[in-house]
Amino acid sequence: MRTEAQVPALQPPEPGLEGAMGHRTLVLPWVLLTLCVTAGTPEVWVQVRMEATELSSFTIRCGFLGSGSISLVTVSWGGPNGAGGTTLAVLHPERGIRQWAPARQARWETQSSISLILEGSGASSPCANTTFCCKFASFPEGSWEACGSLPPSSDPGLSAPPTPAPILRADLAGILGVSGVLLFGCVYLLHLLRRHKHRPAPRLQPSRTSPQAPRARAWAPSQASQAALHVPYATINTSCRPATLDTAHPHGGPSWWASLPTHAAHRPQGPAAWASTPIPARGSFVSVENGLYAQAGERPPHTGPGLTLFPDPRGPRAMEGPLGVR
């Protein structure tokens, strides 16, 4: 999100007052304020539903609650992607979809949510205790994943209240660092504001050279910077082995949907019109986890150019390879 603030032109500070520090003191709060406002912890919600008509058929819905630009979605089963899970689908917001059995139909529902229907028969079909995970790669938040499965006593047709997501992972270590900086910045901003109350404010007046005051553009993760690392897609994995995750499931009453937001209970938003987004510049881009390093030229471990963690529609399950095996 880019924030624009209209700020009147500033007169040079009077000698003996703020000096050179005056400019910095006035600009810094705007920058920090913008960062504080735009900063927010993203959430991923997962809903798993067993179809009433086909008891061995599942519908998985996942969504991303964040302000960033989704670059890729990966759906898997049997655990988190890269931790023993098997990729079911990979969805890219511009390039399309790659899906793997038993996925029957993966699709984007809105700009920030996807759904996946799984086949109800066959050796690879899911079972009631299957754990499904959805991983969203986005900029600037990084990679976020949540998992869910049907409660042990789930009756088709009923819906379970949202429960905390069992897994919330930011694969990019930098995320924590950024959060720390933002937190520090917000605290520092408050400190500056408090100090500012006790000192005379500098005189502000409109610019004499133009009828309109100049625009001071506060910095925030910009669309330009997002575009540089834009690698959209989604993947869904699932497996019918016993769930190894310590998932939280509601035990009250029968439930048909297991809804697992990453934090507080968030209901999925209704369908939203897709915003028209530019196609990322051509170049090598990596899988979901590596999507943000698309231009780095380094290949994620165990990945191949065409297998990609689903930057390539071809190898959703080849999430362990670069992008070739899409």
Epitope: E94, R282, P311, D312, P313, G321, P322, G324, V325
Partner: antibody
């Protein structure tokens, strides 16, 4: 040079099965998905499905789910497609195609003509 | 299934001319459309991917454009070797679907 060399033409009887091959060379076989496409009577193309040589994962369109079986042999860098319960509708040219990391078929096989006739 | 319609089945052109082949999707497919060229008795070959990116080695007289539902492959300064059938493909949703093809003949 990247190449996908397919097996020769097949003349088979209705109700039987046929297994066609696609041998990859010039690149690391397990790095790219292999897809299969059908072209009937020189007309348009139909997407059949894909296999991930690295994991063996497969994907079929509903239409071909009960018709085709996709497999790979990593040791020989070869992908296979078996077609069963053949009818005259299955007479066509079948292509394997490599799915690139840029999300398109960047290399196509030489094609295998399958003719189903009694 | 998403239907990809190539309304012109045959287009006749002369060497040096410009020809535009269109492909219409039955629903929004974003930029997930490719163009392939198939010469007589040959396998298809990639021309354009993701609506407008040119495949390696493809002459710059081939240009792709469009997004959403309407896509165009334009050949400027047509050459005799461009005699072929051109197919569009969408991979936005399963099953992937091809257009019916447009055959370009040289007068």
């Amino acid at each position: 040079e990247v190449q996908l060399q397919q097996s020769g033409p097949e003349l088979v009887k209705p109700g039987s099965s046929v297994k066609i091959s696609c041998k990859a060379s010039g690149y690391t076989f397990t790095d790219y998905n292999m897809d299969w496409v059908k072209q009937s009577h020189g007309q348009s193309l139909e997407y059949i499905g894909a296999v991930n040589p690295n994991t063996g994962d497969i994907s079929y369109t509903q239409k071909f789910k009960d018709k085709a079986t996709l497999t790979v042999d990593k040791s020989s860098s070869t992908a296979y497609m078996e077609l069963r319960s053949l009818t005259s509708e299955d007479s066509a040219v079948y292509y394997c195609a490599r799915w690139s990391e840029s999300w398109y078929f960047d290399v196509w096989g030489t094609g295998t003509t399958v003719t189903v006739s009694s | 299934d998403i239907v990809m319609t190539q309304s012109q089945k045959l287009m006749s052109t002369s060497v040096g001319d410009r020809v535009s082949i269109t492909c219409k999707a039955s629903q929004n497919v974003r930029a997930a459309v490719d163009w392939y060229q198939q010469k007589p008795r040959q396998s298809p070959k990639a021309l354009i991917f993701l609506a407008s990116s040119r495949h390696t080695g493809v002459p710059d007289r081939f240009t792709g454009s469009g997004s959403g539902t309407d896509f165009t492959l334009t050949i400027t300064n047509v050459q005799s070797e461009d005699l072929a059938t051109y197919f569009c493909l969408q991979h936005w949703n399963y099953p992937y679907t091809f257009g019916g093809g447009t055959r370009v003949e040289i007068k």
